[in-house]
């Protein structure tokens, strides 16, 4: 009751920093759990366009913000040009897929790839054919698609001409998009996916300045950013509800990225509150207005008075449950650099499995697919990446402790990523990929690695067996 | 160091208008609100309202609405409040402070500017 | 508006004596007060924000807590230093109040 009093938020998931065995969801006496997933669990792999395609302006592809940013901030990165060049080498990722033998593939679409200046007329032939095909491969081998419509590379033309995000014009200019993706390949998708990680594209792109569009200082930029994604997610969601679901049957969410922490001092309820704000001020900040009560948390609205636009009482009721699943992003995008305000000088940790629990608690236990998770190694490590198995198999552990221990509905994971690509601010100097593309070749072989070998066993055994 | 320096003492008369500094340095400037904040002879402390110096956006109380400008000029980071159609009871010290987002508090504070209002 | 009510509006203390004050908002503003110290002549400092959080470099013999209406703040050995006038402020609600302030001084 104190906790509740205090700390001021409306969820649950302070508890889960009470270390009150009474109290806490998450029973620590389970350090590893040699278990199996629940049957049919969706085990799958992702990548990112901007990441893996390359030719970023070959067959009448427009450039992206991302495109500009790399030519303009990024020293010693001549451009996304060479990548594992997907684009190009399409059979390559299909052979790879079939190889780990996942349940579904999450990729996405490349917006200015189909429409080069971002406005939706006639689509660019070479990109939707690119896409149909792969689609039309991934059906045939029973791999489902889960697309995703934005993953940060928006049409520069967009973001010269409005501004990008910052300008609401672009809320129907990106439900255009969305509509004719629904229309062209909502037949073969039946998991969509509009936006990776708009904390992210707030945070980094209108505050750091460590991703595109790179400005930065500006807060009031970021939260009128995070505000456009998350009206342009409602709206698409709504679209998407009202005219394709009917007939395509599919689900619909947006994927959130998270850090997670713990408390200097674990009795100490203060420190328990900055976690809690911690969480709030990341996570919350999106999950809130879609899984929660269609508004920003609370403390948000105490503190960025000046700055955090207000969701009128009618778009409270429009943002308020537009996701069919909650789809959960845990990775180093959201710990390294982390955002010093969200450390509330705190414990940065890895738990998986005690964010998935804050999720269950402050989002009224909502089915959850982890959409990206894994870690990184240095751009030197080749095929023998035992530092990724390890991180793997922790993460896993904790997907699995969530489920059996916890009750937490976890019913797909995606590990990221097919293959080594272009990462963001870190360039080329990390590797993420279960596959090695040594970028300086001609033909960009897929190679696997220990991981790929590994996660290949997890799916076959649908878990860890003794 | 954060330090937030401002504008000598003013005499006014009724009817005029003032307009306060406060120089910031020790920071970025344009990544946090400047508040204003002002305390009369022997009264306790009252807001005015708000100035985000990268967009230039403000937000005051009711009570200075229509009397008060908050301005900036970005290059010499510098925040201004202009206070027009003085009374006497506008007679007391103008503070500026800067707004901490994760706290939701003045973290730092200038020294203060006395302004008298006397015919 | 909200309005915050401080008291008691003066106190004499002895250096080492346990000093509390209490702060009441006119309506629940949860977690959402600071605390500030103010000399004369000086700039207004911040000892605590959101209800106990010390401010870096503040020291610990200052202390905040309640929730909700209620409220104190709390200096556990009362220092020749800490001779000021103490205010609480709350930001639930625009525009940010202030309480009356409560003076300090050594007897």
């Known amino acids: 009751i104190l906790l509740r009093a205090v700390t001021g938020f409306s969820g649950d998931g302070r508890a889960i920093w009470s270390k009150n065995p009474n109290f806490t969801p998450v029973n620590e006496s389970q350090l590893f759990l040699y278990d199996t997933f629940p049957k049919n669990f969706f085990w799958g792999i992702g990548t990112g366009a901007l990441q893996v395609e390359g030719s970023w302006k070959k067959d009448g592809k427009g450039p992206s913000i991302w495109d500009h940013f790399i030519h303009t901030h990024l020293k010693n990165v001549s451009s996304t040009n060479g990548s594992s060049d997907s684009y190009i080498f399409l059979e390559k990722d299909l052979s790879a897929l079939d190889f780990i033998g996942v349940s579904f593939y999450q990729f996405s679409i490349s917006w200015p790839r189909l429409f080069p200046d971002g406005i939706v007329t006639v689509a660019n032939a070479k990109g939707l054919q690119y896409y149909s095909t792969l689609l039309d491969a991934l059906v045939l081998r029973n791999i489902e698609p889960i697309v995703t419509l934005y993953h940060w590379d928006l049409p520069l033309a967009l973001q010269e001409k409005y501004g990008g995000w910052k300008n609401d014009t672009i809320i129907d200019i990106f439900n255009d998009y969305a509509t004719y993706c629904f229309q062209m390949f909502g037949d073969r998708v039946k998991y969509w996916i509009t936006i990776h990680n708009p904390y992210l594209v707030a945070w980094h792109g209108y505050g750091t300045g460590m991703h595109a569009p790179g400005e930065k200082g500006n807060l009031a930029a970021v939260y009128t950013v995070g505000h456009n994604l998350i009206k342009a997610h409602s709206k698409v969601w709504h679209n998407y509800n009202t005219h394709f679901r009917p007939h395509q049957k599919g689900w619909l969410s947006i994927t959130l990225g998270s850090h997670w922490i713990e408390p200097n001092r674990s009795e100490n309820t203060m420190d328990i509150f900055k976690c809690q704000q911690s969480m709030v001020s990341v996570l919350g900040w999106f999950a809130n207005p879609i899984h929660g009560d269609g508004d920003y948390p609370e403390g948000m609205r105490k503190k960025l008075f000046s700055v955090l636009p207000i969701f009128s009482e009618a778009e409270k009721h429009e943002m308020r449950g537009t996701a069919d699943f909650f789809a959960f992003s845990f990775g180093p995008n959201n710990f390294k650099p982390l955002n010093t305000m969200a450390k509330m000088g705190q414990n940065v940790s890895l738990n998986l499995r005690e964010a998935l629990n804050w999720i269950k608690l402050e989002y009224n236990n909502p089915r959850i697919l982890i959409a990206e998770n894994g870690w990184f190694t240095d751009s030197r490590v080749k095929t023998e990446d035992t530092t990724a198995i390890y991180m793997m198999k922790n993460f896993l552990s904790q997907v699995l402790q969530a489920i059996r221990l916890d009750e937490i509905r976890v019913f797909g994971y995606t590990a990221w990523s097919l293959l080594d690509g272009f990462e963001w601010q870190d360039a080329y100097t990390i590797r993420r990929g279960l596959f090695y593309v040594d970028f300086n070749s001609k033909q960009k072989e897929r190679k696997p690695k220990s991981s790929a070998h590994y996660y290949k066993q997890i799916i076959r055994e649908n878990g860890f067996s003794l | 160091q954060v330090q937030l320096v401002q504008s000598g003492a003013e005499v006014k008369k009724p009817g005029a208008s003032v307009k306060v500094s406060c120089k910031a340095s020790g920071y970025t400037f344009t990544s946090y609100d400047i508040n204003w904040v002002r305390q009369a002879t022997g009264q306790g402390l009252e807001w005015m309202g708000w100035?985000?110096?990268?967009?230039?956006?403000?937000g005051y109380a009711q009570k200075f609405q229509g009397r008060v400008t908050m301005t900036r000029d970005t290059s010499i980071n510098t925040a201004y409040m202009e206070l027009s159609s003085l009374r006497s009871e506008d007679t007391a010290v103008y503070y500026c402070?800067?707004?901490?987002?994760?706290?939701?508090?003045?973290?730092?504070w200038g020294q203060g500017t006395m302004v008298t209002v006397s015919s | 508006d909200i309005q915050m009510a401080q008291s008691p509006s003066s106190l004499s203390a002895s250096v080492g004596d346990r000093v509390t004050i209490t702060c009441q908002a006119s309506?629940?503003?949860?977690?959402?007060l600071n605390w500030y110290q103010l000399k004369p002549g000086k700039a207004p400092k911040l000892l605590i924000y959101d209800v106990s959080n010390l401010e870096t470099g503040v020291p610990s013999r200052f202390s905040g807590g309640g929730s909700g209406t209620d409220f104190t703040f709390t200096i556990s050995s009362l220092q020749p230093e800490d001779i000021a006038t103490y205010y609480c402020q709350q930001y639930d609600n625009l525009p940010l109040t202030f309480g009356p302030g409560t003076k300090v001084d050594i007897k």
């Open positions: 402070a800067k707004y901490n987002w994760n706290y939701g508090a003045f973290d730092f």
């Open positions: 100035m985000n110096p990268h967009s230039g956006n403000t």
């Open positions: 309506q629940d503003i949860s977690i959402y």
